[in-house]
């Protein structure tokens, strides 16, 4: 029967007894950094070029006897993973292996970086079609290896890493931590985060997505048609190689950014149990695994959008935090969360050509998080408009005033210490689908997009007594771009999208005192673009 | 994930260019700066990736890398250039003493250094 | 649950020898490295040595060196430590311990097996 | 192996903090990771703290461990008469390629 991991990835409508995906990624190239690999091993052979890259330090040990089979371990199962001819994800893959990694499965961050240089070399001297690195490694934080993951990835190659099997922050880890980079966590047959002895798989906002990790049957290099069940974050990021292999196939123009959304929209959402991870990182940690798109083709319609976290800002007063889109996203909307609710807001703002999400911290606060929502739109023409506080006690208000913009996201940020001490905040007129509004002591940013096809339609939720959670949804077929909270009053904590979900987070009800205070709104802001969907038929 | 600009818990040495009598010494002001594993164990001192600014050529970073040598042996340092970067990144492997840092950070085009670091199989 | 079982007590004259074993279950026992540990009586942790997970690399404290022997049989999940030409001193419980995690985490110790006291006494 | 530097013992009330220094050279606690370790009367150590100040899941937030320089410390708040045992730290030595333990530190609560 099916493997449990190739089973998990494959869309219900394709289940069988078989794993047959109806394409097996045979016009993309991946390129595997890794230990040497048995090339003549069944589930591989012919599939698979060893090249002549070898970069390596010495083995440890005070006696060292290295035995081919075991050197080549770790490689050989990864490249059956990828594009076995039994046990594979993209069976019509071919691969290129390049030996950065000992027969203890250790090498250097200048050995990894001379492999990239020599992927890239190789690009510009015979351009092939689509390439896929598949990076099953990871050290501490590098600034240099995310730099030269950055060059190749902005080069056109797709990188996919392991998140690292640290039990950990996977930002504290490179290649994981590059942003360019798509960094793989790993799940069990339960959806379970992977357990490694003490450790496991690392979590985060640096990690993209999870996939099968833990008893993952692949090629083993003990014989040339043994088999071996092998865990790791490396196992989860070779499916992920192999799921992008079999995309690029499908729609080889396809560019990283569009790439890297598409992987998340057709993940298995909210199944991972996270009560696995740390409190502080459940928040950051994406409850994706990943599965193939249920039809190779036809998802250009769709708008993507996916939220991204930004680093800690850090407790001092005046701290603040920056959430960054990839070079080809638009940046929608911008939110901000403080586990403490001690926050000032957030803004978007212009940072070398692009919008950037920034949040601020607030005196007394523990530090805040600002979340950006990163969309595909192609043609978009997007502005922030903003609203100086209002003098006026009915708060400040901001629309998009340009002929054919709409509104995408609703910002709010503020100099005052604590809001909530202030006037008792407004509630938004209704029926103004282009106007944010907010506390008359808060600016008020409206992120105003026109792109062809564009619309756009507010959604609130609003519950009139203090909980911790609000939530509000948007509708099949169309995109959450857009999250906030009303009114901003202090109890809130902030407000960030969970998927195709709005989410404001308020503090714990049995701390927040009085209830008058208590009613809390969730804000969506949902769109569509009728240009793709239209596009889309067209192609059809 | 990580910011391109949120070194991320490394130990940063950010030293002043100075002129060394150099005849490119780099534009006053500026600092490269020096990185290193956090993960102690995982350090490989003695091996270093020099990192030139990003529109360096090729002659540049051998010109810069022999530069770096011939400074290090009138001290009295051997220095071996492993590998000369060009394609993703420009820059240099080389293997010096971590005496040597101080100098190679003040040297023309230098954006920063990182020490070689292991990586494992995941 | 994981844990390590080791063999029962043995008394042993000097100079004989003796194979102690240490069963793993419910963990991949080839996907770690494991060590041996010993304690003499009313003494603190003496580390005895390492053998990696596929057996293929080794370390042993000066002590151990060239009387003590380290291995493992992965297909039977368990690991052993021979030793040779006995003295008094070794008198001690010898500790199996998993090493935590792969290459990158080999040198600590999250799991113990519960202890195999060999007594040499002639 | 020369073992890393512990005091014999340390003692404490029920409910306050006590630490244990561990002292090293660059060759093992300066440039390599450090774990602590528990052993109760009579038991198998048990692993608290590993690469300096990461602590294995089950084991309570009371036990934290921080390193400077050559010098490893476990510090246990609210402490509990549970805690009564044996402290041993650990790291690997680079120079004599091998594992070294401290040479232990009875942790006594009184009352």
């Known amino acids: 029967s099916i493997p449990w991991n190739l089973e998990r990835i494959t869309p219900p409508r394709y289940r069988a007894d078989e794993y047959q995906p109806p394409d097996g990624g045979s016009l993309v190239e991946v390129y595997l950094l890794d230990t040497s690999i048995q090339s003549d091993h069944r589930e591989i052979e012919g599939r698979v070029m060893v090249t002549d890259f070898e970069n390596v330090p010495e083995e440890d040990g005070t006696r060292f006897h290295s035995q081919a089979s075991k050197c080549d371990s770790h490689g050989t199962h990864l490249a059956g993973v990828v594009s076995g001819r039994d046990a594979g994800v993209a069976k019509g893959a071919s691969m290129r292996s390049l030996r950065v990694l000992n027969c203890q499965g250790k090498g250097t961050v200048s050995g990894t970086l001379i492999g990239l240089e020599f992927i890239r070399k190789s690009q510009l001297v015979q351009p092939v079609g689509p390439l896929v690195v598949l990076l099953p490694l990871a050290g501490g934080y590098s600034r240099v290896l995310n730099a030269a993951c950055q060059r190749l990835a902005r080069a056109g190659v797709v990188l996919v890493t392991a998140a690292g099997n640290f039990r950990d922050d996977a930002c504290l880890y490179s290649p994981a931590s590059a942003p360019e980079v798509i960094t793989v966590g790993a799940t069990n047959a339960q959806d379970q985060p992977v357990t490694l002895g003490t450790l496991g798989t690392n979590f985060g906002r640096c990690v993209d997505l999870f996939a099968p990790g833990e008893d993952i049957i692949g090629a083993s290099s003990d014989c040339s048609t043994c088999f071996v069940s092998q865990s790791g974050t490396s196992q989860a990021a070779a499916h992920v190689a192999g799921i992008a292999a079999m995309m690029l196939s499908a729609e080889p123009e396809l560019t990283l950014a569009e790439l890297r959304q598409r992987l998340i929209h057709f993940s298995a959402k909210d199944v991972i149990n996270e009560a696995w991870f740390p409190e502080d990182q459940r928040v950051l940690t994406p409850n994706l695994v990943a599965a193939l798109p249920p039809s190779t083709h036809g998802a250009g319609w769709q708008l993507f959008c996916r939220t991204v976290w930004s680093a800690h800002s850090g407790p001092t007063r005046m701290a603040t935090a920056v959430a960054r889109c990839a070079p080809d996203e638009e940046l929608l909307s911008c939110s901000s969360f403080s586990r403490s609710g001690k926050r000032r807001g957030e803004r978007m703002e212009a940072q070398g050509g692009k919008l950037v999400c920034r949040a601020h911290n607030a005196f007394g606060g523990e530090g805040v998080y600002a979340i950006a929502r990163c969309c595909l739109l192609p043609q978009a023409n997007c502005s922030v408009h903003t609203a100086p506080p209002a003098e006026a006690s009915m708060g400040t208000r901001v629309h998009c005033h340009q002929q054919g913009h709409v509104l995408t996201g609703c910002s709010s940020h503020w100099e005052v210490e604590d809001l909530g001490t202030h006037k008792p905040p407004v509630l938004r007129p209704r029926g103004q689908p282009n106007q944010c509004v907010g506390h008359r002591e808060a600016s008020i940013h409206a992120s105003c997009c026109h792109a062809p096809g564009l619309e756009c339609k507010v959604k609130e939720h609003g519950i009139p007594a203090p909980q911790e959670q609000v939530t509000v949804a948007c509708e099949e077929g169309w995109t959450l771009t857009g999250c906030s909270a009303l009114p901003g009053t202090s109890h809130v904590l902030g407000a960030y999208a969970v998927d195709n979900t709005c989410v404001v987070r308020s503090r714990d009800v049995s701390t927040t005192g009085s209830t008058s205070e208590g009613a809390v709104t969730a804000v969506a802001i949902c769109c569509r673009s009728r240009h793709l969907a239209q596009a889309s038929q067209e192609l059809q | 994930q990580e910011d391109e600009d949120g070194d991320y818990e490394e130990l940063v040495l950010a030293l002043r260019s100075e002129e060394d009598g150099l005849a490119e010494a780099p534009e006053h002001g500026t600092t490269a700066t020096f990185h290193r594993c956090a993960k102690d164990p995982w350090r490989l001192p003695g091996t270093y990736v020099v990192v030139l600014k990003e529109e360096t050529h090729l002659s540049q970073s051998e010109r810069t890398a022999r530069r770096l040598q011939a400074q290090a042996a009138r001290r009295g340092y051997l220095t071996k250039i492993l590998h000369v970067f060009h394609g993703l990144l420009p820059g240099f492997l080389v293997k010096m003493s971590g005496d040597l840092l101080e100098l190679a950070l003040k040297l023309p085009h230098v954006d920063y250094i990182e020490e070689d670091s292991s990586v494992f199989a995941q | 649950q994981v844990q390590l079982v080791q063999s029962g007590a043995e008394v042993k004259k000097p100079g004989s020898s003796v194979k102690v074993s240490c069963k793993a279950s419910?963990?991949?026992?080839?996907?770690?490295?494991m060590h041996w540990v010993r304690q003499a009586p009313g003494q603190g942790l003496e580390w005895m040595g390492l053998?990696?997970?596929?057996?293929?690399?080794?370390y042993y404290a000066d002590s151990a060196k060239g009387r003590f022997t380290i291995s493992r049989d992965n297909s039977k999940n368990t690991l052993y430590l021979q030793m040779n030409s006995l003295r008094s001193d070794d008198t001690a419980v010898y500790y199996c311990?998993?090493?935590?995690?792969?290459?990158?985490?080999?040198?600590?110790?999250?799991?113990w097996g519960q202890g195999t006291t060999v007594t040499v006494s002639s | 192996q020369s073992a890393l530097t512990q005091p014999p013992s340390v003692s404490g009330s029920p409910g306050q903090s006590v630490t244990i220094s561990c002292t090293g050279t660059?060759?093992?606690?300066?440039?390599?990771?450090v774990s602590w370790y528990q052993q109760l009367p009579g038991t198998a150590p048990k692993l608290m703290i590993y690469?300096?100040?990461k602590r294995p899941s089950g084991v309570p937030d009371r036990f934290s461990g921080s390193k400077s320089g050559n010098t490893a410390s476990l510090t246990i708040s609210g402490l509990q008469t549970g805690d009564e045992a044996d402290y041993y730290c650990?790291?690997?030595?680079?120079?004599?390629?091998?594992?070294?333990f401290g040479t232990g530190t009875r942790v006594t609560v009184l009352g």
């Open positions: 311990a998993r090493a935590m995690g792969a290459i990158y985490y080999y040198y600590a110790m999250d799991v």
């Open positions: 419910a963990f991949t026992f080839d996907s770690f490295g």
């Open positions: 053998l990696w997970s596929d057996g293929s690399g080794e």
């Open positions: 660059s060759s093992n606690i300066g440039n390599q990771f």
């Open positions: 690469e300096y100040n």
């Open positions: 650990g790291s690997w030595d680079s120079s004599l390629s091998g594992y070294v």
